[in-house]
């Protein structure tokens, strides 16, 4: 039956819900979070907020878990038949409600500190950046609950506790299928403190957020009286109006300002400046700060296509774009890394194809600027180095020697991170 | 070795549609671009445009938008060209080629695929 | 689009004589080219990438030279198996775009 406009009704990660209803949400990877209510308001506005357990009055409460609240035993609502959970099929592995698991190449803005996890909850696949502790040991171990790396002894970190996580749904958004990432999205900006320990209030793109982009609805998450409007696009921090434009900040390299960022009621659209190809004058000259070649003596108008430039050295060495993009689809990732160069003018893409965890295939490819510029599944990830790039071919070779022989998980996205060059490095050249 | 081998030539009529096929082998198929180029009688060679079998993200020479589809399937290592609205100009050698600038802009060819367009 | 402009459109050559055919693009193309061969019946073959990369199993006695708008494909010492058409190719910029091709014909 078709709404009539005239209806108000509330638009939720792609379901429809008529003014006054109320439901627990979807929380990626929590799956059903019992701990939330959400409520459909007479203007159409998703409201969401915290459930508050009262205290209770005896010795040893009881956990259940389709309720949020602990509860006394003697108020125990009676035992229905059990109910059997759908498990989940992911890359042609089953997993079973509520076990967690590891996933590659998801996040295209994993930055080195992070890992992706995943949990299974009722028939769906959630899966999230989890930002990992520092760690102060050299021979870390893995546990069965996290996807982070922990010093033997430590105690384990749960998964509601990590700070500045970003879920994401793989099954129905653009982990799995991204042929039209063509915006360049920053890394996620790590924020110091806590609002909440509840994930949602964390980010725009947070599970809430991401899943209202496209319906329009605005929908406020309420936990601990802090309020979050999804009208507008969040950027290293910062937060930008609908039309608003900036250059995006890309870690340790600061503003990248032959990029530029718009925001698209919640999405930030960014496109690369592309500067002319001819000029008015003989010798045009670059100038630092400036993204195009500018005439001498002429005053460097803000053109569309044409803004300021920031390299980006780094120890003295001038540092490159480097662009990444990952598909996976029946069981297989073909992974793309490239790194531009100014000469020659070029795009070096580093091609792996990997079937369960073996390197089925590995190439490299050289193409235009031109050409590259027209491939929309690219990101951009990182700037690096010349000698950078020179330890990760190199650690390439040898990992592609290895990992067609034998399984490989995690070893081209921790060689990957040789590229990113750290802040703190700064002071170490 | 690399092999890409196209179907059989094709007679349609005019208004009709043919689908081309070019099964690809001794190679990762889903690593590497696939192009396929038009070649009319005695003219030179047109590019039509290329499919990534990865990600399925297809460009086309403006020219051929609305006359080409191009798909792919991994699970095959097989690529297609699908031609619409036939018409005489569309009779041509269809050809598939391989794309990795590394080696060569287009390094293995199919043997072309002959579609002639007559009532 | 990249127009490639490629002459001569055909040409008549002796046997170990030294033949260049030229290919001019309408802007930069950053030596984005490659030329093929493409004998009668046939599928083409590529010669050079890159604008003076030869492929593996081509005869060194082609080379290929130019850079920004001009290329040019040279056969130091003509044989009887160079006889065929010759197009370039840029693939600097969508769409790729072939040059309209030289017929090489023995003198």
């Known amino acids: 039956e078709q709404v009539k406009h005239s209806e108000t009704y509330c638009m939720f990660q792609d379901k429809k819900y008529r003014v006054g209803e109320r439901w627990h949400p979807y929380l990626e990877p929590y799956g059903l979070v019992y701990c939330v209510n959400c409520i459909c308001s007479e203007n159409g506005n998703v409201l969401c907020s915290r459930v508050r357990c009262p205290n209770v009055h005896c010795l040893s409460p009881v956990h259940i878990p389709h309720l949020c609240c602990p509860r006394c035993p003697d108020s125990l609502p009676p035992v229905n038949n059990k109910v059997t959970s759908k498990s989940c099929e992911y890359n042609g592995t089953t997993y079973q409600h509520g076990e967690l698991f590891v996933a590659e190449g998801l996040f295209q803005n994993r930055q080195p500190n992070q890992c992706t996890q995943c949990s299974c909850s009722e028939g769906n696949v959630y899966c999230g950046l989890k930002t990992c502790p520092k760690l102060t040991c050299a021979f870390p171990v893995s546990v069965p609950d996290s996807c982070c790396r922990v010093c033997r002894g430590d105690g384990e970190l749960s998964w509601e506790h990590s700070d500045g996580d970003i879920f994401r749904q793989p099954a129905n958004r653009e982990a799995r299928h991204s042929y039209h990432r063509s915006h360049y999205d920053p890394p996620p900006s790590r924020q110091a403190g806590g609002l909440s320990r509840f994930p949602g209030a964390r980010s725009h793109r947070g599970a809430l957020m991401d899943s209202q982009q496209a319906s329009g609805t605005i929908v406020q998450i309420v936990i601990n009286n802090k309020h979050k409007h999804g009208q507008v696009c969040v950027s290293n921090g910062k937060t930008y109006s609908h039309g608003e434009s900036w250059h995006p900040n890309l870690r340790a390299f600061g503003i990248v300002e032959c990029v530029l960022c718009t925001c698209n009621v919640t999405k930030q659209e960014c496109k690369k400046i592309h500067c002319p190809n001819r000029y008015p004058c003989k010798y045009p000259q670059k100038i630092d700060g400036k993204c195009c070649k500018v005439c001498p003596g002429k005053k460097a108008k803000e053109l569309p296509g044409q803004s300021f430039d920031n390299k980006g050295y780094f120890c003295g060495e001038e540092t490159m774009p480097v662009y990444e993009s990952v598909f996976m689809e029946d069981g297989e990732t073909t992974r793309k890394i490239a790194l531009e160069t100014e000469r020659p003018p070029q795009v070096e893409v580093h091609v792996w194809t990997i079937r369960k965890g073996i390197l089925q295939h590995f190439h490299i490819e050289k193409i235009s600027k031109r050409m590259f510029e027209e491939l929309p599944h690219f990101k951009l990830v990182t700037r690096t180095t010349l000698s950078q790039w020179k330890i990760f071919t190199e650690g390439e070779a040898q990992i592609s020697q290895m990992c067609s022989s034998r399984v490989c998980r995690t070893e081209l996205e921790d060689l990957v991170k040789v590229l990113y060059l750290e802040r703190s490095e700064k002071g170490h050249c | 070795q690399v092999q890409l081998q196209q179907s059989g030539a094709e007679l349609a009529k005019p208004g009709a549609s043919v689908r081309l096929s070019c099964k690809a082998s001794?190679?990762?198929?889903?690593?590497?671009?696939m192009h396929w180029i038009k070649q009319r009688p005695g003219r030179g060679l047109e590019w039509i445009g290329y499919?990534?079998?990865?990600?399925?993200?297809?460009k086309y020479n403006l020219n051929f938008k609305d006359k080409a589809t191009l798909t792919a399937d991994k699970s095959s290592s097989t690529a297609y060209i699908l031609l619409t609205s036939l018409t005489y100009e569309d009779s041509a050698v269809y050809y598939c080629a391989t794309y990795s600038n590394y080696v060569g802009a287009m390094d293995y060819w199919g043997q072309g695929t002959s579609v002639t367009v007559s009532s | 689009d990249i127009k490639m402009t490629q002459s001569p459109s055909s040409m008549y050559a002796s046997l170990g004589e030294r033949v260049t055919i030229t290919c001019k693009a309408s802007?930069?193309?950053?030596?984005?080219l490659s030329w093929f061969q493409q004998k009668p019946g046939k599928s083409p073959k590529t010669l050079i990438y890159?604008?003076?990369r030869l492929v593996d199993g081509v005869p060194s006695r082609f080379s290929g030279s130019g850079s920004g708008q001009d290329y040019s494909l040279t056969i130091s010492s003509l044989e009887y198996e160079d006889m065929g058409i010759y197009y370039c190719?840029?693939?600097?910029?969508?769409?790729?775009?072939f040059g309209a091709g030289t017929k090489l014909e023995l003198k």
């Open positions: 890159r604008a003076n």
């Open positions: 499919i990534d079998p990865s990600s399925r993200y297809t």
């Open positions: 802007q930069d193309i950053n030596s984005f």
């Open positions: 001794g190679y990762s198929f889903s690593s590497y671009w």
């Open positions: 190719l840029q693939y600097d910029e969508f769409p790729l775009t």
